[in-house]
Interface confidence: low
């Protein structure tokens, strides 16, 4: 996958869009993380609705949100009040079984606001962190669930 | 129905390379992920990788990523697997299999087999 | 890669009896989804394998309802409750939680 650009400007939103084949990914939730170096685990920031037919409807995890187009087959992903810190390699993902699927992979890069004079050395990029088998595999991370989400789905 | 037919029994020289088919039927070819799986003679099975016909997306087991390349031909609905640089290590039977999508929530499973083709890499 | 483990490599029944086959994996099988991706083939001789059970305990369509799957994390397990001469063979547990897909290396189920 080559990667996508996404400028926005610190303090305002971002949209990012990913476009997909809506035939292959049909019935997959779909999920925004945030990557960890080049070979490190993507770490997941915010997924689509637990209910599939209910993707459009937008979550939001902090000040990201995710909402998806599941017959155009388009994911959005919007970063209200882009700061410096939000800066780095994303993935959005499709929630494949029992993969995660690359959709796209995003550079998000913060501009600072001309009316903001802060030092641009606060531009923050991930280092490097370990190495991990495969980069397909969905990688956990413990969060607060958001109001109305089930921690896990039945389990088998 | 479903079916998956393989190509018929291979006599191979070592060193030569191999081409292997899986004609699908009965089923949205291009839409399924479509597995490729080792079998040697008294033995276990080996998972080789994965091929999504759709657009051509694949999946190798690392050890068969240099010899083995997976395609397919969404317009004979035929899935392909090509061996090269054979050794006595590679006879065995190949076996195509479709992966289950038990949609919305994929079981990744293999539903439907081939029935084998059968590959003997003798001088 | 994930290496299955399956015990016993040879099952000696008799026809009637309950049968009981184990599966182990190296790590966890609980994808970070939150579902197990455990799956269970019967290969009889000179054929290909054919899916019994997938996700640990969802028969599929046309398994009669003697087989049963079952376990968590690591460990699993296929019982056959009475065992008939149509299901002799061998049975391979196989895991697609991580790529690579692996399988175990197979039980062989025969007439005692």
């Known amino acids: 996958h080559n990667t996508t650009v996404f400028q926005g400007v610190a303090g305002q939103s971002l949209q990012v869009s990913c476009p997909y084949d809506s035939m292959k990914h049909w019935g997959r939730r779909k999920a925004w993380c945030r990557q960890l170096g080049e070979k490190g685990p993507c770490q997941r920031v915010v997924s689509t609705h637990n209910l599939w037919l209910l993707s459009f409807l937008r979550r939001w995890n902090g000040s990201t949100a995710i909402t998806d187009d599941t017959l155009g087959g388009t994911l959005t992903i919007t970063l209200r009040n882009l700061q410096p810190h939000d800066a780095g390699l994303y993935q959005c993902q499709s929630l494949a079984g029992s993969e995660a699927d690359t959709l796209r992979k995003v550079l998000v890069e913060v501009l600072a606001d001309p009316l903001d004079h802060r030092d641009a050395g606060d531009l923050w990029f991930p280092g490097e962190s370990e190495s991990f088998e495969d980069a397909h595999v969905e990688h956990s991370i413990s969060r607060s669930l958001l109001e109305g989400e089930i921690p896990f789905p039945p389990t088998s | 129905q479903v079916q998956l037919q393989q190509s018929g029994p291979e006599l191979v020289k070592p060193g030569a390379s191999l081409k292997i088919s899986c004609k699908a039927s009965g089923y949205a070819f291009s839409s399924s992920w479509m597995n490729w799986v080792k079998q040697r003679p008294g033995k276990g099975l080996e998972w080789i990788g994965r091929i999504y016909p759709g657009d051509g997306d694949t999946n190798y087991n690392g050890e068969f990523r240099v010899r083995a390349t997976l395609t397919a031909d969404t317009s004979s609905t035929t899935a392909y697997m090509q061996l090269s640089s054979l050794t006595s290590e590679d006879s065995a039977v190949y076996f195509c299999?479709?992966?289950?999508?038990?949609?919305?929530?994929?079981?990744?499973?293999?539903?439907?087999w081939g029935q084998g083709a059968s590959v003997t890499v003798s001088s | 890669d994930v290496v299955m483990t399956q015990t016993p490599l040879s099952l000696p029944v008799s026809l009637g009896d309950q049968a009981s086959i184990s599966c182990r994996s190296s790590?966890?099988?609980?994808?970070?989804?939150?579902?197990?991706?455990l799956h269970w083939y019967l290969q009889k001789p000179g054929q290909s394998p054919k899916l019994l059970i997938y996700?640990?305990?969802n028969r599929f369509s046309g398994v009669p309802d003697r087989f049963s799957g079952s376990g968590s994390g690591t460990d699993f397990t296929l019982k056959i409750s009475r065992v008939e001469a149509d299901d002799l063979g061998v049975y391979f547990c196989?895991?697609?939680?991580?790529?690579?897909?692996?399988f175990g290396g197979g039980t062989k189920l025969e007439i005692k």
């Open positions: 299999a479709r992966l289950l999508r038990n949609q919305p929530g994929e079981s990744y499973a293999m539903d439907y």
């Open positions: 196989s895991q697609s939680t991580r790529v690579p897909y692996t």
């Open positions: 790590q966890s099988l609980v994808h970070s989804n939150g579902y197990t991706y």
């Open positions: 996700k640990v305990s």
